[in-house]
């Protein structure tokens, strides 16, 4: 491990379409990948009229957009589907939306999936 870097070995797993995809709905996902690559966690969600609906959470492959990010934060302004990634075990348990373009006070929506 490189000093100061959070190695990601497992992430929170959630799949809203678990029945269609034939997966578990929730759990812990071990992260696999080429040994020369970094690994991350991600979360995707939708904001339906102010209500947060998690789409998926899990492991994410080597991506410079995620390097050295200990928190999972979406910065894109009003995306259709929100996405964030981070480094460190289970770092996708909580996620937030802080749009970079926003002039008004940004709001944070830390969310953990409710058990089925």
């Amino acid at each position: 491990a490189i000093l100061g870097r959070s190695e990601t070995q497992e992430c929170l797993f959630f799949n809203a379409n678990w029945e269609r995809d034939r997966t578990n709905q929730t759990g812990v996902e071990p992260c696999y990948g080429d040994k020369d690559k970094r690994r991350h966690c991600f979360a995707t969600w939708k904001n339906i009229s102010g209500s947060i609906e998690i789409v998926k959470q899990g492991c994410w492959l080597d991506d410079i957009n995620c390097y050295d990010r200990t928190d999972c934060i979406e910065k894109k302004d009003s995306p259709e589907v929100y996405f964030c990634c981070c480094e460190g075990n289970m770092c996708n348990e909580k996620f937030s939306y802080f749009p970079e373009m926003e002039v008004t006070q940004p709001t944070s929506n830390p969310v953990t999936p409710k058990p089925p």
């Epitope: 690559k37 994410w60 492959l61 957009n65």
Partner: antibody, heavy 115, light 111 residues
């Protein structure tokens, strides 16, 4: 092992559209991006665009903006690249590649645009 | 995004070393360690040789190395072998907020 298998060669008329598929296996499809790259005969590589396979978010090269659409079907682990208003200069081999680092590539799909 | 600049061709004898350059701007090559190098043999898909400026994928011989100085990235191949004769392309990471761009390609001839 990671594999990206693309659809077969296509011959198209100018003005028409083509849709090339890229079926992924050997890894979790929703854990990365799929990029699309093309290579005209005897020419270099040209980046067309990318899709985040889990969120569906896309980015396109300015040159192809408005003419290319990249989609992903997570239920079949397949990405698609559709190019419209084809012209002869679009004759090329079209590749899909996994992730932002383009670490695995499809075998390529030759699209020939000819009247 | 304009294409990265590579020499059209380079050559070397077996056992020698060659270096291929890839020049961009402060906003692509110069801004971060996200330059990749690919090897392409005729009629084949490109093969990643170096990513993130200097990281080598498993299976790639350590004769291949990458570096960067300012806005120029370089691929060095030492102990040239006949099978190294191919086209080499530099390119950038593409995904999220990053847009991809490739160099024009360099034809390496092993004399």
């Amino acid at each position: 092992q990671v594999q990206l298998v693309q659809s077969g060669a296509e011959v198209k008329k100018p003005g028409s559209s083509v849709k090339v598929s890229c079926k992924a296996s050997g890894y979790t499809f929703t854990s990365s991006y799929i990029n699309w790259v093309r290579q005209a005969p005897g020419q270099g590589l040209e980046w067309m665009g990318t899709i985040n396979a889990v969120s569906g978010s896309t980015s396109y090269a300015q040159k192809f903006q408005g003419r290319v659409t990249i989609t992903a079907d997570t239920s079949t682990s397949t990405a698609y690249m559709e190019l419209s208003s084809l012209r002869s200069e679009d004759t090329a081999v079209y590749y899909c590649a996994r992730g932002g680092w383009f670490d695995y590539w499809g075998q390529g799909t030759l699209v020939t645009v000819s009247s | 995004q304009s294409a990265l600049t590579q020499p059209r061709s380079v050559s070397g004898s077996p056992g020698q070393s060659v270096t291929i350059s890839c020049t961009g701007t402060s906003s692509d090559v110069g801004s971060a360690n996200y330059v990749n190098w690919y090897q392409q043999h005729p009629g084949k898909a490109p093969k990643p040789m170096i990513y993130g400026v200097s990281r080598r994928p498993s299976g790639v011989p350590d004769r291949f190395s990458g570096s960067k100085s300012g806005n120029t990235a370089s691929l060095t191949i030492s102990g040239l072998q006949a099978e190294d004769e191919a086209d080499y392309y530099c390119g950038t990471f593409a995904g999220g907020k990053y847009y991809g761009v490739f160099g024009g390609g360099t034809k390496l001839t092993v004399l």
